[in-house]
């Protein structure tokens, strides 16, 4: 690469040689060979050879210049027409940069995922900076005063067990590159309000024999909190929309619902909880299908083996219709 | 045939409590939601609180959250609705109703709740 | 919650008319819905569930149609008996909700 080469003089950028995209740029050669004195200086970007906008200052130094320079990377060298000699003759070459200094980081969201022993947290970078940008996660406890970094490029997965300094801490990163720094609003977090619970699991459905096929949902969930608000949507899978049932469920309990419906149809359920008193919703379960007989007997469904995949449900199922989360739907 | 008799109504102060009972028979009631449906004296109906068969799951309207409680007794086929703090605006006809969701295709004869100084 | 408007308050028709009878869903409902009809001084009692399957002893005059947001409860033949409240209902969110009711008088 151009790191490598080994110069016989001297290249230099201005203003640098990572700049603000946009910026005018001059890129300076000056050569240092010995037993040459140079007809020409000719200047490469990117292999191609600059017709335009270089100016030679004197017998050893020559400058391209570059009105708006807007590409993020560009590979630059420049070589001498020495008399007698077939070849030009490698002077020297840089790597430039162009890109912009980082928007403060927003957005920032941390959140544990039930098992993962991982607080996450992510945010948004904001513009394309088009040059190396590095983000450093700060954590402070707001209880011992402690504070942590980690390094990161776009999110973070901070160890719970290296969170030794109580429940409660603010969170906030920084993004620094060549051309500036930024700092993203603090976060205060409660490591027991950000727990994003795991799913719940269908387990099985029956349709029981009767005029109006009654279907029970077995499902089961890994919330251990007694009281517990959960929605359960389903919908038969040629239609649009979903019906969602609410309920106050207690974990002492099979977890069980019923649903009168049409017959001869197929149907798909899903699942989620929220703990008493938390923020955070499990994601849906996945989804469960369900058919309702024909004529009156009963029909038994179990979850395959391999996760079930709906190939009649499209992303237009969602349209013109909202759930508080539709973050896991069938699509 | 299936038959729900509502019981337990009556004339009471705002502030105070009544439970309203509802005996089944006539389709296994252990097996079946089972809901309180009120009517208004306007006519409107509202659907007040569901109970899964076994118990385990309830759906209270936000009105009456934390004042209201339904529940059931399934070896005596009967479904309950304790109701406390009650306001004027709870005055109505409250109905027993099978299944209790996600349509009532039985409904009993009814049971008046007045809230009244 | 879901608003469930019955437009008309009142509707008067004649023994052997057909009449229909319209609720309309503030948002989607699907094909979530159900009609009761409520006799005076007697219970509601379920005619259509799933907007157009009839309950068990319905007699066929009664039908039901639509989808989404616009439902309608048909009588054909309207008969003496039919004197009545009418009352829709959706079962696709919570709070269950239910029309304001629409009287039918026979002439």
């Known amino acids: 690469g151009i790191a490598t080469i080994n110069c016989s003089g001297n290249m230099w950028v201005e203003p640098g040689e990572i700049f603000q995209m946009g910026m005018n740029v001059s890129v300076y050669c000056q050569e240092a060979l010995k037993n040459c004195r140079p007809r020409n200086l000719h200047f490469y970007k990117n292999g191609f050879k600059e017709r335009f906008h270089i100016t030679r200052i004197n017998r050893t130094t020559a400058r391209v210049w570059y009105k708006g320079f807007s590409e993020p990377h560009a590979s630059m060298y420049c070589t001498a027409e020495c008399p007698g000699r077939f070849q030009e003759t490698l002077i020297c070459g840089k790597d430039i940069s162009s890109g912009y200094p980082p928007d403060a980081p927003s957005n920032m969201t941390c959140v544990i995922y039930e098992y993962s022993g991982n607080m996450t947290c992510t945010w948004n970078t904001g513009k394309p900076t088009y040059i190396d940008t590095k983000y450093t996660v700060h954590v402070k406890s707001l209880e011992t005063e402690e504070q942590q970094q980690y390094l990161a490029s776009n999110y973070v997965n901070i160890s719970t067990d290296s969170l030794q300094g109580g429940r409660k801490y603010l969170v906030w990163v920084q993004a620094v590159n060549a051309l500036g720094m930024e700092n993203s609003q603090q976060l205060q977090v409660h490591l027991d309000d950000i727990v994003i619970p795991s799913p719940s699991i269908i387990s099985r459905a029956e349709t029981t024999n009767a005029n109006v096929p009654k279907t029970i949902i077995y499902w089961k969930s890994k919330i251990m909190t007694g009281k517990v608000f959960c929605e359960m949507r389903y919908k038969a899978t040629t239609n649009q929309t979903w019906n969602v049932k609410e309920f106050d469920t207690n974990y002492t309990y099979v977890q069980q619902s019923e649903f009168y419906l049409e017959p001869n149809s197929k149907y798909v359920f899903q699942v989620r909880c929220q703990g008493t008193g938390k923020r955070n919703w499990q994601p849906w379960s996945s989804p469960f299908v369900h058919q309702t007989p024909q004529t009156a007997s009963q029909v038994t469904s179990k979850p395959p083996h391999e996760p079930q995949k709906i190939e009649m449900l499209t992303a237009t199922i969602f349209k013109g219709h909202s759930t508080s989360d539709n973050s896991q739907d069938i699509g | 045939e299936v038959k729900l008799v509502e019981s337990g109504g009556g004339l009471v102060q705002p502030g105070g409590s009544l439970k309203l009972s509802c005996a089944a028979s006539?389709?296994?009631?252990?097996?079946?939601?089972m809901s309180w449906v009120r009517q208004t004296p306007e006519k409107r109906l509202e659907l007040v609180a569901e109970i899964s068969s076994n118990g385990g799951s309830t759906y209270h309207i936000d009105t009456v959250k934390g004042r209201f409680t339904i529940s059931r007794d399934n070896a005596k086929n009967t479904l309950y609705l304790q109701m406390s703090s009650l306001k004027s605006e709870d005055t109505a006809m409250y109905y027993c109703?099978?299944?209790?969701?996600?349509?009532?295709?039985?409904w009993g004869q009814g049971t008046t709740v007045t809230v009244s100084a | 919650d879901i608003v469930m408007t019955q437009s008309h308050r009142f509707m008067s028709t004649s023994v052997g008319e057909r009449v229909s009878i319209t609720c309309k869903a503030s948002q989607d409902v699907g094909n979530a819905v159900a009609w009761y009809q409520q006799k005076p001084g007697q219970s509601p009692k379920l005619l259509i569930y799933w907007t157009s399957t009839r309950h068990n002893g319905v007699p066929d005059r009664f039908t039901g149609s639509g989808s989404g947001t616009d439902f309608t409860l048909t009588i054909s033949n309207v008969q003496g008996e039919d004197l009545a409240d009418y009352f829709c209902?959706?079962?696709?969110?919570?709070?269950?909700?239910f029309g304001s009711g629409t009287k039918l008088e026979i002439k």
């Open positions: 006539g389709f296994t009631f252990s097996s079946d939601t």
């Open positions: 109703a099978s299944p209790g969701y996600p349509w009532f295709a039985y």
């Open positions: 209902q959706q079962y696709n969110r919570y709070p269950l909700t």
